[in-house]
């Protein structure tokens, strides 16, 4: 169970918000949905 608030995991990359879940080392992964750049 990954515990996180997705608004606390934003980084700005080329004017896009990218979210990194705790267990993900890059932006490869499953689209979480209803956010910007959120993958896990």
């Amino acid at each position: 169970d990954a515990e996180f608030r997705h608004d606390s995991g934003y980084e700005v990359h080329h004017q896009k918000l990218v979210f990194f879940a705790e267990d993900v080392g890059s932006n490869k992964g499953a689209i979480i949905g209803l956010m910007v750049g959120g993958v896990v």
Partner: antibody, heavy 120, light 111 residues
Amino acid sequence: QVQLVQSGAEVKKPGASVKVSCKASGYTFTTYAIHWVRQAPGQGLEWMGFTSPYSGVSNYNQKFKGRVTMTRDTSTSTVYMELSSLRSEDTAVYYCARFDNYDRGYVRDYWGQGTLVTVS
Amino acid sequence: DIVMTQSPDSLAVSLGERATINCRASESVDNDRISFLNWYQQKPGQPPKLLIYAATKQGTGVPDRFSGSGSGTDFTLTISSLQAEDVAVYYCQQSKEFPWSFGGGTKVEIK
């Protein structure tokens, strides 16, 4: 076409567990998280959590902490939601769903048909 | 957790008239000028359907009579000219943080 097909209705006794399945087709299974939302009879919507078919990582609503487990089987493109220690208040229709992110250029949602779980 | 509150609980509107539904969040659902606020329509016996995302953007295939507005904590869904097929329950939902949360719903009926 994208489809999420859920398992059939269940009747359970208080204290028992239920495992609902959601089989995905029409897209690459590992590219979208699957969310679970439930709806008690005549009531509103409640988000239970999601699981990533890509990584297996799950995020649960703390309300269900310790009672809910979401897993996936990539060989069958199926996600499971198991809820334990059932009580009468868990009687609800359980939906699986997937969503696009805001930055996709289009945003679509896809939902399963719902699974009625009755605890009695 | 963010609590979403909708008003009114129910609404009766004449065909062709405007319907307005309000949604208030217990804290801001904005982040970097984006409002993480979504609206759904649910008809009896069916799953919800996404109408509006990011407060103002229409979902795929959603008729132009549905529009969303607002930012921060206060949001509005407007149906500009109510049609018979719009009879449903409408929910707002925040996706700014987990757990995602929904408003209690607004039932829209024909007057």
